[in-house]
């Protein structure tokens, strides 16, 4: 169908509440596209009509709740005049019981999930709620072992709980709760956190975190296109640069002639006391060459790499 | 470092109250849940109760409600737990313990014995 | 009231074995669960917070794990201070409860 296959990272989330995700991949979806989201390989489009549990809106599926059986892989294709795009986003439904957070077992954990609070410092956990504009989302209630948090130490704001002089009794495990309205109905979504206290001031001074990558490999058909994020948390005053290289070389500039690896635009998410910095690398083809070739995030004094890697072949299919 | 440092033990007759109190030091009094578990002799844990030191908010108990009563006095980061119209199964060890974390910090239990 | 069925209620081991005890919710509490440890005279302290985390200065001979609604507390090889009682409780809605408690013995 001449479509071109990329692969996101698995998404994991709790039945019995609303999930949404959004098909964005910004050199394609910035221009004139169209979208069209699919469950596992179907040739049926997921239904527009806002009535149905599962249903497309806009850009997103929407699902009003996300259930047990809701696991798979799922498709959203972006036909551009002149290109067309597969994104394949494989999400992995667990039972959850309302208060509980400890779900680390699990694997690929996004970092939504795991949030660092700052020993002494005024700090801040968000509660990441992704939804389309569609669905109208209520005031926010935090938890900590099942138990409504409060006192003056603890601020609302927003999609935030402020955390004032930050002491290593907060640690533990936290849960937000929010509820979303949408078409008249009304759903509660509530997401875990997992957090732990650092002593380090800010992030390490003024040495950035690489949260991902973390020097691993990454199975990888030949072929494909493959988008990697390297994810950097860094003091709000920092001056310092982040970008992919290969060789010791800036991407942009080593396949400068075939611009077939691309770094992508920066962009950040200001907290209270630290940026957290998303760069991407795009290989709009992976190649032979590629393989067991360190391409490495840096930021500042940090570094990080990935090695793509060949998947194993699967003798099943002999 | 964490410490909660419960009154001493009590002998009460039948009918009377006791009250017990629990100090807290090492961490922000009026941030989290405070419970109150009791022991009697020789028999397992039961949970009474807990208050909240921020708002003064209880939760008991079904067995408890209408006999304890939890208080704080947050200028001195103390809380109390006062049981009423005592009998002689109300003889029992009782503790408070934080829920920083869920029941991270435990006091070292104040003896109560009922007795005519 | 969430009730928690502990078992068995009390075991003769000697040092270096494996123990297993074993606590059952009567409904889902997730991983909103405590191991404690009581010796004799002493308050309860707390060992593995929230199924499987084990407090600070807790040796890692001590483990725990959940299946479903049933929850185990593993001491991988019992050391002469684990003889003590155990005791499981669920916080994940009040009123909190406490299994009923697992002694350990000297065999």
């Known amino acids: 169908d001449g479509c071109k296959d990329i692969f996101m990272k698995n998404e994991i989330l709790s039945a019995s509440q609303p999930f949404a995700f959004n098909c964005t991949f910004p050199p394609i979806t910035s221009g004139e596209v169209s979208v069209t989201w699919y469950k596992n390989s179907s040739k049926i489009p997921v239904s527009k009509i806002i009535q149905s549990r599962i249903h497309q809106d806009e850009t997103w599926i929407l699902f009003l709740p996300m259930e047990w059986g809701d696991s798979g892989v799922y498709q959203c294709v972006i036909k551009g005049r002149d290109s067309c795009h597969r994104i394949h986003v494989n999400l992995t439904v667990f039972e959850k019981h309302w208060c509980d957070t400890s779900i680390g077992g699990l694997p690929n954990l996004s970092d939504e999930y795991k949030q660092i609070l700052h020993l002494g410092k005024d700090d801040s956990l968000t509660c990441h709620l992704h939804f389309p504009k569609s669905c109208v989302l209520g005031p926010i209630k935090w938890y900590k072992d099942c138990n409504e948090i409060k006192g003056e130490r603890f601020t609302v704001l927003e999609t935030r709980l402020l955390v004032s002089n930050v002491s290593a009794e907060d640690r533990g495990n936290y849960a937000c709760q929010a509820i979303l309205t949408h078409s008249g109905k009304q759903y509660e979504v509530l997401n875990g956190i997992t957090v732990s206290i650092t002593e380090r001031a800010g992030y390490g001074g003024s040495v950035p975190k690489i949260i991902y990558p973390k020097n691993h490999s990454i199975e990888v058909q030949l072929g494909t296109t493959l988008i990697v994020d390297c994810n950097v948390t860094d003091t709000k005053d920092n001056t310092n640069l982040r970008c992919w290289r290969v060789n010791n070389t800036l991407v942009d500039d080593y396949y400068d002639e075939s611009k077939r690896i691309r770094e992508g635009v920066e962009t950040h998410v200001s907290f209270r006391e630290h940026n957290l910095y998303t760069v991407n690398i795009t290989f709009l083809e992976v190649k032979m060459e590629d393989y067991g070739l360190p391409f490495m995030c840096h930021a500042g004094v940090s570094t990080a790499y990935i090695i793509l890697q060949l998947p194993a072949p699967d003798f099943r299919a002999y | 470092q964490v410490q909660l440092v419960q009154s001493g033990a009590e002998v009460k007759k039948p009918g009377a109250s006791v009250k017990v109190s629990c100090k807290v030091s090492?961490?922000?009094?009026?941030?989290?849940?405070m419970n109150w578990v009791n022991q009697a002799p020789g028999q397992g844990l039961e949970w009474m109760g807990m208050?909240?030191?921020?708002?003064?908010?209880?939760r008991l108990a079904q067995k408890f409600k209408g006999r304890v009563t939890m208080t704080v006095d947050k200028s001195t980061s103390t809380v109390y737990m006062e049981l009423s119209s005592l009998r002689s199964e109300d003889t029992a060890v009782y503790y408070c313990a934080s829920s920083t974390t869920a029941f991270a910090y435990w006091g070292q239990g104040t003896l109560v014995t009922v007795s005519s | 009231d969430i009730q928690m069925t502990q078992s068995p209620s009390s075991l003769s081991a000697s040092v270096g074995d494996r123990v297993t005890i074993t606590c059952r919710a009567s409904?889902?509490?997730?991983?909103?669960l405590n191991w404690l440890q009581q010796k004799p005279g002493k308050a309860p302290k707390r060992l593995i917070y929230?199924?499987?985390s084990l407090d600070p200065g807790v040796p890692s001979r001590f483990s725990g794990s959940r299946s479903g609604t049933d929850y185990t507390l593993t001491i991988s090889s019992l050391q002469p201070e684990d003889f003590a009682t155990y005791y499981c409780?669920?916080?994940?809605?009040?009123?909190?409860?406490f299994g009923q408690g697992t002694k350990v013995e000297i065999k």
């Open positions: 090492g961490y922000f009094f009026t941030s989290y849940w």
């Open positions: 208050i909240h030191p921020y708002d003064s908010e209880t």
């Open positions: 929230a199924t499987s």
């Open positions: 409780l669920q916080y994940a809605s009040s009123p909190y409860t």
């Open positions: 409904q889902d509490i997730g991983n909103a």
